[in-house]
């Protein structure tokens, strides 16, 4: 038997993926566990194998269909169970009735690219991935820029309160290496959270022209 406190958290990416993390103090490392999804009104069900992400937590992704297919709606309730093998039987370790559109976390923005760079400014664009058509253009973004000698945690957050898939960074230092990240969040859902940060985009501002004021 496995004792200790257990936490089972899942998010829906708004299209065809439910990602889950299960943590259990005192859990057995060599136990085989999985997440099972059973919707209340759909003909499919789905399973994924929990894989370790740290000493006492496991994660997996329930792939519900093609990446851009709309597999769930606001009225769906999905019973999610953590099942662990005990000998020849499966034991239910955790269970929740999951409301997908109350627990949203979109995929991280992708395809970050520098559109135009100058000495003091840089225009960057990105794309969102696998976001439901239900949101239309009603999404918000947060962005941050890593300056030399600083950490990501120290970087001020820039908020974009609309679906604007570009930003113009200003007051940059010439001939300097920077990194940029962005994340996205829908407006809907009581327990909705920010997407993971995008992969960082590295860029360098242009050097100041010699003999000119900058």
């Amino acid at each position: 038997a496995v004792n200790g406190t257990s936490q089972f958290t899942c998010f829906y990416n708004s299209r065809a993926n439910i990602s889950c993390v299960w943590s259990q103090d005192g859990a057995l490392q060599d136990t085989s566990c999985q997440v099972h999804a059973w919707p209340d009104r759909r003909r499919w069900n789905q399973t994924c194998e929990l894989l370790p992400v740290s000493q006492a937590s496991w994660a997996c992704n329930l792939i519900l269909g093609a990446p851009d297919s709309q597999k769930l709606t606001t009225v769906d309730i999905v019973t999610l169970r953590v099942l662990c093998r005990e000998g020849v039987r499966w034991r239910v370790m955790a269970i929740q009735d999951f409301k997908p559109f109350e627990n949203l976390r979109l995929m991280a923005p992708i395809s970050l690219q520098v559109v135009h760079v100058e000495t003091h400014r840089c225009n960057i664009s990105w794309e969102i991935s696998q976001a439901s058509h239900y949101f239309e253009r009603h999404l918000e973004f947060e962005a941050r820029t890593l300056s030399p000698g600083h950490t990501w945690e120290e970087a001020p957050l820039l908020t974009l309160k609309q679906k604007q898939e570009w930003i113009c960074l200003e007051t940059l230092t010439p001939d300097t290496q920077y990194e940029f990240q962005v994340r996205v969040k829908p407006l809907q859902g009581e327990f909705t959270t920010w997407s993971p940060w995008s992969q960082p985009l590295a860029f360098r501002t242009k050097p100041a022209a010699l003999g000119k004021d900058t």
Epitope: R41, R42, T73, T74, D76, H133, Y134, F135, E136, L139
Partner: nanobody
Framework: QLQLVESGGGLVQTGGSLRLSCAVS????????MGWYRQVPGKQRELVAD???????KYADSVKGRFSILRDSVKNTVYLQMSSLKPEDTGIYYC?????????????WGQGTQVTVSS
Amino acid sequence: QLQLVESGGGLVQTGGSLRLSCAVSGSRFISDVMGWYRQVPGKQRELVADMADGGSAKYADSVKGRFSILRDSVKNTVYLQMSSLKPEDTGIYYCKAGLWIAGRHSDYWGQGTQVTVSS
């Protein structure tokens, strides 16, 4: 102004049929579910049938095999085909639509249409 307009209610004999319809019109929206609920005096409003995106229909046990729901997502209209009607099907039938407006989801209700099944 957003509106849900119901029609098709009326008085019918036991064993007869009726077809209810409900159309949503008005401001910009996307519907992800539409359905029918009924209310009888002194009781809570209860689900009769609904249909969500992806074609998943849900029916109350008491109407399975007798009622059929059809949703036209292009016209934003939902129909309820009721056959083999019984006196216990009598009540006010309300249309409900789950609508996405400006990135948020809300439920909207029609005014209701009376269905009376006489024995």
